[in-house]
């Protein structure tokens, strides 16, 4: 019997996720695969030989290889999930625990600038805990959370790239910024 620590798993709000059982191969010896959501100690899906597959609701799908799909992730899907696998003799051959954490995907960052005081802002409106990275002509300038403000002093024309990322997504915007010599918006 193998009991391991939780597998840290990240899913995106509103999207599907597959909880794949690592190092598990389905075979004729397997009689029972049971998935539980541990917060309410409730069985959510179960495969049993010669019986119809059980699923607590339609957002769950259990594949033949034991993988659990959760459709259209919601915030209350964030939980600890446990899968227990038994052979035909009733022996618990595998147990895995998944710590499912959910984040909202980041939106595409918005780059805006003013030529008057050569200030550029990159901002991301949506997403859980986004980190922003700003680049000028390929060189990394700075990183921040949610908003970056940068005052540039060198060339009046440059290509800026801003990347927003969190554990479930990543989005980038590129803007060629060009300002007249005298600096007008």
């Amino acid at each position: 019997k193998e009991i391991t620590n939780a597998l840290e798993t990240w899913g995106a709000l509103g999207q599907d996720i597959n909880l794949d059982i690592p190092s598990f191969q389905m075979s004729d010896d397997i009689d029972d695969i049971k998935w539980e959501k541990t917060s309410d100690k409730k069985k959510i899906a179960q495969f049993r030989k010669e019986k119809e597959t059980f699923k607590e609701k339609d957002t769950y799908k259990l594949f033949k290889n034991g993988t659990l799909k959760i459709k259209h992730l919601k915030t209350d899907d964030q939980d600890i999930y446990k899968v227990s696998i038994y052979d035909t003799k009733g022996k618990n051959v595998l147990e895995k625990i998944f710590d499912l954490k959910i984040q909202e995907r980041v939106s595409k960052p918005k780059i805006s600038w003013t030529c008057i005081n050569t200030t550029l802002t990159c901002e991301v409106m949506n997403g859980t805990d986004p980190e922003l990275n700003l680049y000028q002509d390929g060189k990394h300038l700075k990183l921040s959370q949610r908003v970056i403000t940068h005052k540039w002093t060198t060339s009046l024309s440059a290509k800026f790239k801003c990347t927003a990322g969190n554990k479930v997504s990543k989005e980038s915007s590129v803007e060629p910024v060009s300002c007249p010599e005298k600096g007008l918006d």
Partner: antibody, heavy 120, light 107 residues
Framework: QVQLQQPGTELVRPGSSVKLSCKAS????????VNWVKQRPDQGLEWIGR????????HYNQKFTDKAISTIDTSSNTAYMQLSTLTSDASAVYYC?????????????WGQGTLVTVSS | DIVMTQSPATLSVTPGDRVSLSCRAS??????LHWYQQKSHESPRLLIK???QSISGIPSRFSGSGSGSDFTLSINSVEPEDVGVYYC?????????FGAGTKLELR
Amino acid sequence: QVQLQQPGTELVRPGSSVKLSCKASGYTFTSYWVNWVKQRPDQGLEWIGRIDPYDSETHYNQKFTDKAISTIDTSSNTAYMQLSTLTSDASAVYYCSRSPRDSSTNLADWGQGTLVTVSS
Amino acid sequence: DIVMTQSPATLSVTPGDRVSLSCRASQSISDYLHWYQQKSHESPRLLIKYASQSISGIPSRFSGSGSGSDFTLSINSVEPEDVGVYYCQNGHSFPLTFGAGTKLELR
């Protein structure tokens, strides 16, 4: 249960190259950058660069731009770093570490390191 | 590149002591400063992130403070297992850079 597995040692000839591996398990591979850090015997830590398994974006320390190339194999959850044209000062322990994409500069977990010895 | 300077280079302590390790950045890095511990023949491990944020599994005797360019790692009652080298790291801009380390040893 997060694990970053690295081979223990690599013995290489001067002028040749070596490809170091780092196999990740216990977490969502595409949610974290994989960083590479060099440590020469009884010396400090030197950041070489990093790669994002989500889209293979890379950042390098300029000092290693012509020396190191990072790649990813998402099918096996493995990161690689190729070091080329090796000289004796490349003899060091090379660590891989992971950093979360939403707070990407803290190196949260580390592999055991691969000792690279450059010798003829 | 941002240069990180740590002091002292070596610190000799007695178990139970409260100790402070200093780290200075060559320019302001806000709170983008991370601390690592490396014991002999082991990999480094993250102790404190963003100057003062604690890490799950790290004993509460470790704490961090500071912002801008001056930072401190404190151990409020040193245990024998705390022996090792402590590194601070700039997490503000690339390349990520580390201090040369402070070696903590038992007197």
